[in-house]
Amino acid sequence: TPEVWVQVRMEATELSSFTIRCGFLGSGSISLVTVSWGGPNGAGGTTLAVLHPERGIRQWAPARQARWETQSSISLILEGSGASSPCANTTFCCKFASFPEGSWEACGSLPPSSDPGLSA
């Protein structure tokens, strides 16, 4: 069964800046990746970025840079300032859509005791 992993890291240089990394462990080819915060995209979460392998990347504030790391993993950097900036207990979710298998999603957040720079 395919799985999704999520890592959340706070940047040591900017304490309110986050890096989210997500990956898909499965055999299908990825059609779309949706990154959201505040819960899954289908359950009240707010979309931060949508990544398509052919048609490019769309992102919304406070997302600063979304990119493909490999064919099955992505990363997203969030701005650390402004009213919409994330806080330490924010939940981030990644949903990978693979054709024709379907979609798999997982969520993660910064561990309560995390030091800046440590992976969740």
Epitope: S29, S31, N41, H52, A97, F99, P100, E101, G102, S103
Partner: antibody, heavy 120, light 107 residues
Framework: EVQLVESGGGLVQPGGSLRLSCAAS????????MSWVRQAPGKGLELVAA????????YYPDTVKGRFTISRDDAENSLYLQMNSLRAEDTAVYYC?????????????WGQGTLVTVSS | EIVMTQSPPTLSLSPGERVTLSCKAS??????VAWYQEKPGQAPRLLIY???HRFTGIPARFSGSGSGTDFTLTISSLQPEDFAVYYC?????????FGQGTKLEIK
Amino acid sequence: EVQLVESGGGLVQPGGSLRLSCAASGFTFSSYHMSWVRQAPGKGLELVAAISRDGDSTYYPDTVKGRFTISRDDAENSLYLQMNSLRAEDTAVYYCSRHEDYFGFAMDSWGQGTLVTVSS
Amino acid sequence: EIVMTQSPPTLSLSPGERVTLSCKASQSVSNDVAWYQEKPGQAPRLLIYYVSHRFTGIPARFSGSGSGTDFTLTISSLQPEDFAVYYCHQAYRSPWTFGQGTKLEIK
């Protein structure tokens, strides 16, 4: 304008074979996942075959697995469904459809359908 | 397999009425739910995708809502051309499945 035009339907005896074609135009065919969906008389919709945009992944429900084969020719902008060992219960209108990644794989374009009748 | 159950199977209504069609999934399907309209002799037509997003050209009287396992399609004021069969569909997990359909007929 997106257009999908099916052909190849007709009357065939039980145990016989038929090859359906779908000619696509008005969009970049190679960038889309495609499917065949059927509707038997008085029944609902059933997805009987799907193929990923790269042609590497296919899907068949148990009802047609081993008998139906979906394929595509991106150079010809065409989708095919080879149907072997046909049964009376395969009698239906067969639709060619296009999946939109950004719509959660919803089928945003359909052909007008081609009727397949399996009867002796 | 995720089973999509639509209710009721048939509804008899008059033009101008408001109608809500129900679709229940046997397990969570996230937001990967679409609604299609089918008329006799015509191909199915996409109305709603991602639970609540209207497809291009679909009138505002059509709206979708729900989450998890319970979804609805609402037509705020039925027009004569709305009498048809409506199907919900999940593309969250293979095998992708449709509901059995709800037929809207004129009273």
